[in-house]
Amino acid sequence: CKAMHVAQPAVVLASSRGIASFVCEYASPGKATEVRVTVLRQADSQVTEVCAATYMMGNELTFLDDSICTGTSSGNQVNLTIQGLRAMDTGLYICKVELMYPPPYYLGIGNGTQIYVIDPEPCPDSDF
């Protein structure tokens, strides 16, 4: 297993609709044809998997149907979007990239993107 550098933004603010997007960029040492991208959430020293996708170079990222993530890839960049976020989902979201093929296997883990989610204020009842 060899190490690989992964870069991602330090901070992202989710939209009022609970959507956060960020770019995960990896320094590929060669021409990988099978790449696995995983988003992990770290909060209170606990790590959980948010979503994961394996893609063949040149093809679209495919997350599971019920995933809260979507994404696109371009070269060594992956554009990730996480939907359905609430204030309680605020935390550090870590991008993990694995170059599965061809050998050797490379693993890269980013420093994480702190995603802040603010629940929108409910609309006041109108008097009309």
Epitope: C1, E34, M100, Y105, I109
Partner: nanobody
Framework: EVQLVESGGGLVQPGGSLRLSCAAS????????MGWYRQAPGKQRDLVAS???????NYADSVKGRFTISRDGAKNTVYLQMNSLKPEDTAVYYC?????????????WGQGTQVTVSS
Amino acid sequence: EVQLVESGGGLVQPGGSLRLSCAASGNIFTRNIMGWYRQAPGKQRDLVASITPGGNINYADSVKGRFTISRDGAKNTVYLQMNSLKPEDTAVYYCNAHGSILLNRSNYWGQGTQVTVSS
């Protein structure tokens, strides 16, 4: 607990065939590169074949055209079909799973199964 359980080894005559199986826990099987390695007495452990979650395959030159690796997602099992066996294929064959789990690298080994090719 992660477990890799191998089976299928044994004694076979030169030119014969064997099929090795390795059953793995589900999470390991779907996320990791599964491989077969072998170790002959007094030698180092060498890669025989590996298969990625996406189905990409890598073979050692010495087994190309004779050995076939495959994976069955429904059974969480990886297979090594070995044909046209030679005496130099005699070794202990180990199943391996490597990749990562959450933030940690993972590298798991089975207990090994003996393959002896002899007349």
